[in-house]
């Protein structure tokens, strides 16, 4: 996160860290807890690393440096990448992770509410992006979970800024005209959440951007509302029943 500040314990209890353990262990992506056994993230996090057993998912944590060999983590039972995701394009950058064992909810570890299907009428004015990603383009992973308040921008405006890419209706953009605040490398897959009527909702999944926090280059996020049918279909067919945190 560029231009952010430290988060507090329990402030973003749905935020998870997706880490890979090969020779060493490192944080690669963020994710959002959406049910006892489900994490929503970006499909591109798994490019070149599709093997379930190399991944470790840490939930209920604030500081990555607090992780030791004794810190509990979740393992992956199944990675479900959207069937239309292709490595050669930026569309459908969404994936579900089914955990091997369900998580108990606590003050520091609980799910984010999902938006209503095709939610286009809600005007979100209080949106935040969180993650342990770089704090500048040529930076490094941060120890303490960062947060930044970023306004949504219209798809029309976003398309003007990214003429060489196709900004679809299944994407949502956020950023300041002057730059300075944005997600960055390592924040991919993490949440863009907006507070509306006193409730936090998962509006976007951190996907891509041209550099980080550059002027007139907003961040681009997968629009979760556009994938509600897919999320419900995959989680229900796997569970037999829905275990999602739907909006009240």
């Amino acid at each position: 996160i560029v231009g952010g500040t430290n988060s507090s314990w329990g402030e973003w209890p749905w935020q998870v860290s997706l880490q890979v353990k090969l020779t060493a262990q490192r944080h690669l992506c963020g994710g959002s807890l959406i049910g006892h056994q489900w994490v929503l993230t970006a499909a591109h996090c798994f490019d070149g690393l599709p093997l379930q057993d190399v991944w470790r998912i840490y939930s209920g944590i604030l500081n990555l440096s607090d992780i030791t060999k004794d810190t509990p983590f979740s393992q992956i039972k199944e990675i479900i990448i959207h069937q239309n995701y292709k490595v050669s394009e930026g569309n459908h950058d969404i994936a579900l992770i089914k955990l091997q064992a369900p998580l108990n909810y606590t003050e520091f570890q609980k799910p984010i509410c999902l938006p209503s299907k095709g939610d286009t009428s809600t005007i979100y004015t209080n949106c935040w992006v969180t993650g342990w990603g770089f704090s500048k383009e040529k930076g490094e992973i941060q120890n303490i979970l960062q947060k930044v308040n970023i306004p949504l921008v219209t798809n029309e405006e976003c398309q003007k800024r990214y003429q060489d890419y196709k900004i679809t209706q299944r994407m949502v953009c956020a950023g300041y005209k002057e730059g300075g605040k944005d997600a960055c490398k390592g924040d991919s897959g993490g949440p863009l959440v907006c507070k509306h009527n006193g409730m936090w909702r998962l509006v976007g999944i951190t996907s891509w951007g041209e550099g980080c926090a550059r002027r007139e280059q907003p961040g681009v996020y997968t629009k979760v509302a556009e994938y509600m049918d897919w999320i419900l279909e995959k989680t229900q067919s796997s569970d037999g029943k829905a275990q999602m945190q739907s909006p009240a």
């Epitope: 050669s88 394009e89 196709k166």
Partner: antibody
Framework: EVQLLESGGGLVQPGGSLRLSCAAS????????MTWVRQAPGKGLEWVSY????????IYADSVKGRFTISRDNSKNTLYLQMNSLRAEDTAVYYC??????????????????WGQGTLVTVSS | EIVLTQSPGTLSLSPGERATLSCRTS???????LAWYQQKPGQAPRLLIY???SRATGIPDRFSGSGSGTDFTLTISRLEPEDFAVYYC?????????FGQGTKVEIK
């Protein structure tokens, strides 16, 4: 299966014009940046031009700027290269290519993911 | 413009040997925008590596890419008969997009 099929090449006199076409299939054409690359006989590859998915943004190599025009018709899944004021040094096999733009570490990638088989343009008197 | 210089110009090796091809750029290139292609006589180029190190779909794992900044490498761990061809590096970090002049890998 992605397919790109160029046509329109041939023999043309210096100063003449030619229009190349590239028919695309097997992918969502309107979502992709498209490009033309050429290769003179026995030489290396030279990038010529690219066009944004909507067609609203185009970039050219200095060697063809002002003479060549890239365009696309997304309703027909077709890419074009209008070549005017042709010179002997424009003689080459012209390839159209689909530009892959995946996501890696929150940035986009860019590479020529799929190529057509090429069409030969010969400029000679 | 960014100039890409490939070396050596020609590499004479036997099947089973290791091939190391170099691509140096005149300016910094974001590795996300560095690709390698293989071209055989009379054929269109074929994508091998994108993002400096990611193998394209269907490319055997004997091909690998590495490097960053201004220094990139394509390695073929054990040459197969079908690998003898011309290899090009290419950058799309900044327009004009440019290619290296190519390295020909020939049978010794």
């Amino acid at each position: 299966e992605v397919q790109l099929l160029e046509s329109g090449g041939g023999l043309v006199q210096p100063g003449g014009s030619l229009r190349l076409s590239c028919a695309a299939s097997g992918f969502t054409f309107s979502h992709y940046l498209m490009t033309w690359v050429r290769q003179a006989p026995g030489k290396g590859l030279e990038w010529v031009s690219y066009i944004s998915p909507s067609g609203g943004h185009t970039i050219y190599a200095d060697s063809v700027k002002g003479r060549f025009t890239i365009s696309r018709d997304n309703s027909k899944n077709t890419l074009y290269l209008q070549m005017n004021s042709l010179r002997a040094e424009d003689t080459a096999v012209y390839y159209c290519a689909m530009v892959g733009q995946g996501i890696r570490g929150r940035s986009r990638t860019s590479y020529f993911a799929q190529w057509g088989q090429g069409t030969l343009v010969t400029v000679s008197s | 413009e960014i100039v890409l210089t490939q070396s050596p110009g020609t590499l004479s090796l036997s099947p089973g040997e290791r091939a190391t091809l170099s691509c140096r750029t005149s300016q910094f290139v974001n590795s996300n925008y560095l690709a390698w292609y293989q071209q055989k006589p009379g054929q269109a180029p074929r994508l091998l590596i994108y993002g400096a190190s990611s193998r394209a779909t269907g490319i055997p794992d004997r091909f690998s890419g590495s490097g960053s900044g201004t220094d990139f490498t394509l390695t073929i761990s054990r040459l197969e008969p079908e690998d003898f061809a011309v290899y090009y590096c290419q950058q799309s970090s900044r327009t004009p997009w440019t290619f290296g002049q190519g390295t020909k890998v020939e049978i010794k």
